[in-house]
Amino acid sequence: FKVATPYSLYVCPEGQQVTLTCRLLGPVDKGHDVTFYKTWYRSSRGEVQTCSERRPIRQLTFQDLHLHHGGHQAAQTSHDLAQRHGLESASDHHGQFSITMRNLTLLDSGLYCCLVVEIRHHHSEHRVHGAMELQVQTGKDAPSNCVVYPSSSQDSEQIT
């Protein structure tokens, strides 16, 4: 399986909310001994590998933000903890999972990573990640709504 990031860059005004999205692609083993662990964290474009370092998102670690379930079941993180920090991560039945950040500030700018771990309990873990950039802008040059740039090209779309 692979992880796709529909958008590689999100440019948002301060105070807005944004939903960063990843999508699980390819055949997914739905056997009873295969489970999926999904999470989000901030990182950097490191010298060795992008997304290898795991930094908190608004003080919440990747442990706090994880989603756990088998196959394509829907799941959500612990509501109370995340919502206190203006965050919510969720997953649907179709392999799409996301993190929503409310009331964006300049401090939210940076590289965000989604991580999917396919756990085959008597064999190994298979991990795949996706990366995307969030730029929060303020002032007269800031867009009125979030503008997203698809990963495959530089055409932009405005999200209202």
Partner: antibody, heavy 117, light 107 residues
Framework: QVQLQESGPGLVKPSETLSLTCTVS????????WSWIRKPPGKGLEWIGY???????NYNPSLKSRVTISVDTSKSQFSLKLSSVTAADTAVYYC???????????WGQGTMVTVSS | EIVLTQSPATLSLSPGERATLSCRAS??????LAWYQQKPGQAPRLLIY???NRATGIPARFSGSGSGTDFTLTISSLEPEDFAVYYC?????????FGGGTKVEIK
Amino acid sequence: QVQLQESGPGLVKPSETLSLTCTVSGGSISSYYWSWIRKPPGKGLEWIGYIYYSGSTNYNPSLKSRVTISVDTSKSQFSLKLSSVTAADTAVYYCARDIPAFALDIWGQGTMVTVSS
Amino acid sequence: EIVLTQSPATLSLSPGERATLSCRASQSVSYYLAWYQQKPGQAPRLLIYDAFNRATGIPARFSGSGSGTDFTLTISSLEPEDFAVYYCQQRINWPLTFGGGTKVEIK
């Protein structure tokens, strides 16, 4: 802050079954792998196995025929049973939280189990 | 199973000196390697994950490097509390395995 605490008898007779329980406090047991690791005197660390929150288990092949790990989510506990013990099973036994694609990040303080008649 | 060999078995150094610990895997573990510190009577403590990332709260004097089969843990300037046993551990597949440990002792 998640904390782990092992409990169980410190002395077990040869050929009997070693039984230990790990109590998880300060967090949910309904996530992650919950593992057992041991350290025999003068030796290194040995992974025994884990139970995933979903109930799936995975054991070290060297111990698989003698090991059972179970979980009681209602009590926030998971347990280790090791049958037909010998003196070679004398060790400090640790329970630990293991996060997928990460590491064993939280450990209990360990409990010494001696196998002797 | 993957065998991890640590060297040296014992490292005798003075506070303030640099410690270099090695861990070699019997086959590639990519960068899926962790380092732990264990002091007498205590549980192991996670220092480094994924070969080179410091765990939360670990001082900057600890650093990890390497990938594939050869890994290094470096303590840039030993503090009195750093004298302990250090273990590497792989997680590219099960069973999880640990190295035999390197004891860093006061010279």
